[in-house]
């Protein structure tokens, strides 16, 4: 179970889903990406205050060593717990292909 | 192939493992934890600059938006990409057993 | 292999809402890239591009058509949806839903249904 | 909107014999990729209709290699290099570079 989903810094200012879009040359992608031409880039961005949506043991460590030692040792970080995928129709060789991306759009965040 | 392993910041800035010791006391693990009574935490720690140890395509990108939009995107940040078990003598109901966790020591890091 | 299938009454009444809902099998509605599409061939003619809805819920409509227009999505339902106000006999046509990559690359469709408006 | 113009309107053909269906755009399909925004698709009596060719040349997965598309800027073209009895159907170019997309009129080839 995840540990707790109320944010005490007010709503939305801790680590959640945001949808940031993108064109391709943004990313750096224009010289190999054709489609889609803008991307819905879905990351995770906001605060992650004690023992928010801690991913394991550790986040909940490095929440613990934090408090102590807050100059050596950062709070935990809100990063992608999960993926979906994405599909790319891009540059090849040999012409153009579909492909798909499993690692590139964010679908679930925590903080670790 | 995981990307660029050269800090760019200079030698031991960039994302690595660093080992910070613990008591039980620090970690709020006094009251459940008898053995081993100082703990030696690795963590993940130190800067993400462009492209260090990004994990994914998720991380590549998130450094293209963050250049762009350093106020909406924060950079990728320093996290284990994996961990080493660790065992701890904990305090149970009906006694004292051995507890293997597997989330709790970092054994590798990456930025994402 | 992702299927779509429309489904929803084959008959509305003028003035009234048209409704349909594309259900999405063999694939999750959550891939990024793919746009969850409505498109429309009247009787005997060629084909309309109504609108399109990422998986996030951004959408984009046909500006001919917009103002009557809403296309939703549910994504643990693995469903999207068609509403179109205030319809006319002008709005029967066979309706169908697709997958496609942006604007393009529509490479699968719903078998279609057809609606007509009348009373 | 951009306007599509295809023709012939109707196409009797011949099996084993080719066929070209041209397909004109009211402005230039060419983006500054170098890429051609264009589909080609089939829709075969009582069918939906399937993707052929996208970005002018491409042929889609599982699609014939007698099927060819060609051309650049306003004018394009679709070829069948030898037509089979299951190419019957109406035929659809469809502009995709920008919104929304639009589609020809068709042209519907029948065997002779």
């Known amino acids: 179970a995840r540990n707790g989903d109320h944010c005490p810094l007010g709503p939305g200012r801790c680590c959640r889903l945001h949808t940031v879009r993108a064109s391709l040359e943004d990313l750096g992608w224009a010289d190999w990406v054709l489609s889609p031409r803008e991307v819905q880039v879905t990351m995770c961005i906001g605060a992650c205050p004690s023992q928010f949506r801690a991913a394991n043991m550790h986040a909940q460590i490095k929440t613990s060593l934090h408090r102590l030692k807050p100059d050596t040792v950062p709070a935990p970080c809100c990063v992608p717990a999960s993926y979906n995928p994405m599909v790319l129709i891009q540059k090849t060789d040999t012409g153009v292909s579909l492909q798909t991306y499993d690692d590139l759009l964010a679908k679930d965040c925590h903080c670790i | 192939a995981r990307n660029g392993d050269h800090c760019p910041l200079g030698p031991g800035r960039c994302c690595r493992l660093h080992t910070v010791r613990a008591s039980l006391e620090d970690l709020g693990w006094a009251d459940w934890v008898l053995s081993p009574r100082e703990v030696q935490v690795t963590m993940c720690i130190g800067a993400c600059p462009s492209q260090f140890r990004a994990a994914n395509m998720h991380a590549q990108i998130k450094t293209s938006l963050h250049r762009l939009k350093p106020d909406t995107v924060p950079a990728p940040c320093c996290v284990p990409a994996s961990y080493n078990p660790m065992v701890l003598i904990q305090k149970t109901d009906t006694g004292v057993s051995l507890q293997t966790y597997d989330d709790l020591l970092a054994k590798d890091c990456h930025c994402i | 292999q992702v299927q779509l299938q429309e489904s929803g009454p084959g008959l509305v009444k003028p003035s009234q809402t048209l409704s349909l809902t594309c259900t999405v099998s063999?694939?999750?509605?959550?891939?990024?890239?793919?746009?969850w599409t409505w498109i429309r061939q009247h009787p005997g003619k060629g084909l309309e591009w109504i609108g399109a809805?990422?998986?996030?819920?951004?959408?984009v409509y046909n500006p001919s058509l917009k103002s009557r227009v809403t296309i939703s999505v549910d994504t643990s339902k693995n469903q999207f949806s068609l509403k179109l106000s205030s319809v006319t006999a002008a709005d029967t046509a066979v309706y169908y839903c697709?997958?496609?990559?942006?604007?393009?690359?529509?490479?699968?469709w719903g078998q279609g249904t057809l609606v007509t408006v009348s009373s | 909107d951009i306007v599509m113009t295809q023709s012939p309107l109707s196409l009797p053909v011949t099996p084993g014999e080719p066929a070209s269906i041209s397909c004109r755009s009211s402005?230039?399909?060419?983006?500054?990729?170098?890429?051609?925004?264009l589909d080609w698709y089939l829709q075969k009596p009582g069918q939906s209709p399937q993707l052929l060719i996208y970005?002018?040349?491409n042929r889609a997965s599982g699609v014939p290699d007698r099927f060819s598309g060609s051309g650049s800027g306003t004018d394009f073209t679709l070829k069948i290099s030898r037509v089979e009895a299951e190419d019957v159907g109406v035929y659809y170019c469809?502009?995709?570079?920008?919104?929304?997309?639009?589609f020809g009129g068709g042209t519907k080839v029948e065997i002779k």
């Open positions: 469809m502009q995709t570079l920008e919104a929304p997309p639009t």
């Open positions: 697709a997958r496609g990559v942006e604007y393009q690359h529509f490479n699968e």
């Open positions: 402005q230039s399909l060419l983006h500054s990729n170098g890429y051609n925004y």
């Open positions: 809805i990422y998986y996030s819920g951004s959408t």
């Open positions: 063999g694939g999750s509605i959550n891939s990024g890239g793919y746009y």
């Open positions: 970005l002018g040349s």
